[in-house]
C-alpha cells in the first residue's frame, strides 16, 4: 500500500512514499522517512550558519547528498535550499558537515555567485552561494 504525500512546497510533483513496504524510521514527528533517512523542509529563510544551527538543535544536520539511488526523491525538489556542503579553499574541495569530501559525479556544482556554501536544487545540482544569504533549508537525519 502506498500513501501519497503532497508536499507542494518542496516537490515539483506529487511524491509517493511507501509506508508499509518496508519499515522506515524512526523519524521526528512530521518528518519524511525515505530509504532510511529522515528529511524535513523548513520554509523559513536563514543564512547557512543559522540553518545549520537549526538542524543541529533538532538532532539533525543539513542535507547531505550521498547516493542518487537512495535519495532519488531529491530529483524532484523544487527551488533552492541550503544543504550541508561547504567549500574548503585550502584544498579546493567541497566538504560535508561531517568532514567527508563530496564524491565525484554526485552533484553538478554551479557557480551562481562568489561563495563558500551551496544550495541544493532539483536533479542533483549544487548552486554556489554566499553563506550569509538567507534561504530555506533541508534538514536530514540518518535512521541507521
Amino acid at each position: 500500500i502506498w500513501s501519497a504525500v503532497f508536499l507542494n512546497s518542496l516537490f515539483n510533483q506529487e511524491v509517493q512514499i511507501p509506508l508499509t513496504e518496508s519499515y522506515c524510521g524512526p523519524c521526528p514527528k512530521n518528518w519524511i522517512c525515505y530509504k532510511n533517512n529522515c528529511y524535513q523542509f523548513f520554509d523559513e529563510s536563514k543564512n547557512w550558519y543559522e540553518s545549520q544551527a537549526s538542524c543541529m538543535s533538532q538532532n539533525a544536520s543539513l542535507l547531505k547528498v550521498y547516493s542518487k539511488e537512495d535519495q532519488d526523491l531529491l530529483k524532484l525538489v523544487k527551488s533552492y535550499h541550503w544543504m550541508g556542503l561547504v567549500h574548503i579553499p585550502t584544498n579546493g574541495s567541497w566538504q560535508w558537515e561531517d568532514g567527508s569530501i563530496l564524491s565525484p559525479n554526485l552533484l553538478t556544482i554551479i557557480e551562481m555567485q562568489k561563495g563558500d556554501c551551496a544550495l541544493y536544487a532539483s536533479s542533483f545540482k549544487g548552486y554556489i552561494e554566499n553563506c550569509s544569504t538567507p534561504n530555506t533549508y533541508i534538514c536530514m537525519q540518518r535512521t541507521v
Epitope: I110, E111, I128
Partner: antibody
C-alpha cells in the same frame, strides 16, 4: 582541456566603444563564471568583472558605468563591452576562469588580446 | 576596496639565494593568491589560498601569512624564477591585485 581565447579589434578610437569576445572550451558556461582582467603596458593587473553561470554579474565599481559583460552559453562565448574609451584604457585584456568550482583565484587564463586606444 | 601593497617592487637575487616578497592588505583578508608572469605571457596561477602550490609549481616555492600580511618565499632561487609576481585577494568586491614584485636574477 580548459581553454579560453580572446578576440578583439586591436585598435579603438578615443570615445568609441570596445567589444571583446572570449570563446571557451573544455567547460560549460552554465557551470562556471568567467572573469575579465586587464593589464596596461608595463603595469599591473586590474579585475574588471565577472559573469556567473546563471548570468548575473559583478563589476569593479570604478568601471561599472562603462562596462557590460554578457554571454551566449550555446556558443560558449563571453562578451565584454566598454564604452567611452580613453587613452588609459590601452591594455592587454584577458578572460579567465577559477581554478575549480568556487575558487577565488584564476586557474585558467586566455592568451590576452591587445587593445590600443589611439586616434 | 582592499588595497594590496607589494614589496619590494624589484628584488634582485643570485641563484641559490633565499628570497621573500611580501604583500600587505589594507584590511584583513582570509586568503592570498599569487601569480607568476613572464614578459609576453599571461599570468600563471602560482600559489592559491595562501600556501597551496598550483599544479607544476616547484617545491622551492612556499606561501604563508594571515590577516593583513602575506609572503611568497623561494628557498633557493633559480634563473627560471625571474618574473613578476602578483598577489590577489577576493575577500570582498572588488577583487584586487598587488602592483607586483619583479624578481631579477643576477
Amino acid at each position: 582541456q580548459v581553454q579560453l581565447q580572446e578576440s578583439g579589434p586591436g585598435l579603438v578610437a578615443p570615445s568609441q566603444s570596445l567589444s571583446i569576445t572570449c570563446t571557451v572550451s573544455g567547460f560549460s558556461l552554465t557551470s562556471y563564471g568567467v572573469h575579465w582582467i586587464r593589464q596596461p603596458p608595463g603595469k599591473g593587473l586590474e579585475w574588471l568583472g565577472v559573469i556567473w553561470a546563471g548570468g548575473s554579474t559583478n563589476y569593479n565599481s570604478a568601471l561599472m558605468s562603462r562596462l557590460s559583460i554578457s554571454k551566449d552559453n550555446s556558443k560558449s562565448q563571453v562578451f565584454l563591452k566598454m564604452n567611452s574609451l580613453q587613452i588609459d584604457d590601452t591594455a592587454m585584456y584577458y578572460c579567465a576562469r577559477g581554478g575549480y568550482e568556487g575558487a577565488a583565484w584564476f586557474g585558467y587564463w586566455g592568451q590576452g588580446t591587445t587593445v590600443t586606444v589611439s586616434s | 576596496d582592499i588595497q594590496l601593497t607589494q614589496s619590494p617592487a624589484i628584488l634582485s637575487a643570485s641563484p641559490g639565494e633565499k628570497v621573500t616578497m611580501t604583500c600587505r592588505a589594507s584590511s584583513s583578508v582570509s586568503y592570498m593568491h599569487w601569480y607568476q608572469q613572464k614578459p609576453g605571457s599571461s599570468p600563471k596561477p602560482w600559489i592559491y589560498a595562501t600556501s597551496n602550490l598550483a599544479s607544476g609549481v616547484p617545491a622551492r616555492f612556499s606561501g604563508s601569512g594571515s590577516g593583513t600580511s602575506y609572503s611568497l618565499t623561494i628557498s633557493r632561487v633559480e634563473a627560471e624564477d625571474a618574473a613578476t609576481y602578483y598577489c590577489q585577494q577576493w575577500n570582498s568586491n572588488p577583487l584586487t591585485f598587488g602592483a607586483g614584485t619583479k624578481l631579477e636574477i643576477k
